[in-house]
């Protein structure tokens, strides 16, 4: 039961950086994506500010801050209509996160 | 950063009991909070989680035997109808990925007639 | 529903000698599984997680391996107070599953 070069173990994620050029000179576009091997009842999400697999049924019910995306000592709250959450720091700066 | 469990006692059986576990140190809302407990002489049981929205999960044979719920600074555990199998030391513990990175002491609950 | 075999449920170690404790799965657990020690009228201290992560604060002499449904804690160069008893844990879903615990005694 080895993993295959590139394989994920499951119920882990890894961050993909894609580097691609421009079509001008000297301005290079990086992007990030995450990719994931979920386990059985889990899918893709975010925990303390890093994909992660979570519980599916976060997802489904919109209980963002059940995914625990923010980091340790920051405050959690969901958007209304529960659209995304928003992260606090304790110096009060605010992260918003929407989901599509 | 720490845990510590309090309201364990001796009860009759039948008699609702509540168990708190308080955070020091930490969020409880950055946490998923669980209760174990541990029969004198056996080994570690997990009954139950909750989520920072309030959702629980049980063990199977934990369903309606025990209530788990929260406040901005607690975690309670109710053991519904205690009965003399449910005699053992309780913990609350941490858990952000699954496996416990911090315990309380434990508090000992004792029923008897 | 996940059950983990642990298995010595006990044994009898010499200072400087080598501890293996085993747990099988009752299905593949993908890794997700930790270690807890554990000293008479104490809670459990996690010494592994993710079945090879060691601890902060965990001396190098624990270590943990496997895969699938086979896992392994071995105690290299055991020490006197590692005297304790010894618990495996599944979390690739719920319910979590604990198992019933490896006493390991030091002579």
């Known amino acids: 039961q080895f993993l295959k070069e590139g394989q994920l173990a499951a119920g882990t994620c890894e961050i993909v950086t894609l580097d691609r050029d421009s079509s001008q000179p000297r301005i290079e576009e990086r992007s990030q994506t995450a990719r994931c091997a979920c386990r059985k009842g889990q899918i893709a999400g975010t925990t303390r500010a890093r994909p992660a697999c979570v519980d599916a049924r976060i997802i489904k019910t919109k209980q963002w801050c059940d995914m625990l995306p923010c980091l340790e000592g920051e405050g959690c709250d969901l958007l209304i209509n529960r659209s995304g959450w928003t992260c606090t720091q304790p110096g009060g700066r605010i992260k918003t996160t929407t989901v599509s | 950063q720490s845990l510590e469990e309090s309201g364990g006692r001796l009860v009759t059986p039948g008699t609702p009991l509540t168990l708190t576990c308080t955070a020091s140190g930490f969020s409880l809302s950055s946490y998923y909070m669980n209760w174990v407990r541990q029969a004198p002489g056996k080994g570690l049981e997990w009954i139950g989680i909750?989520?920072?929205?309030?959702t629980t999960y049980y063990a199977g044979w934990a369903k309606g035997r025990f209530t788990i719920s929260k406040t901005s600074t607690t975690v309670d555990l109710k053991i519904t109808s205690p009965t003399s199998e449910d005699t053992a030391t309780y913990f609350c513990a941490r858990t952000v990925s699954g496996y416990f990175d911090i315990w309380g002491p434990g508090t000992l609950v004792t029923v008897s007639l | 529903e996940l059950d983990l075999t642990q298995t010595p449920p006990s044994l009898s170690a010499s200072v400087g000698g080598t501890v293996t404790i085993n747990c099988l799965a009752s299905e593949d657990i993908y890794s997700a599984l930790a270690w807890y020690q554990q000293k008479p009228g104490k809670p459990p201290t996690l010494l592994i997680s993710?079945?090879?992560n060691l601890e902060s604060g965990v001396p190098p002499r624990f270590s943990g391996s496997g895969s699938g449904t086979d896992y392994t804690l071995t105690i290299g160069g055991v020490q006197a107070e590692d005297a304790a008893t010894y618990f495996c844990?599944?979390?690739?879903?719920?319910?979590?599953?604990f198992g019933a615990g490896t006493n390991v005694e030091i002579k």
């Open positions: 909750i989520y920072p929205s309030g």
């Open positions: 993710g079945t090879s």
């Open positions: 844990q599944g979390y690739s879903s719920y319910p979590l599953t």
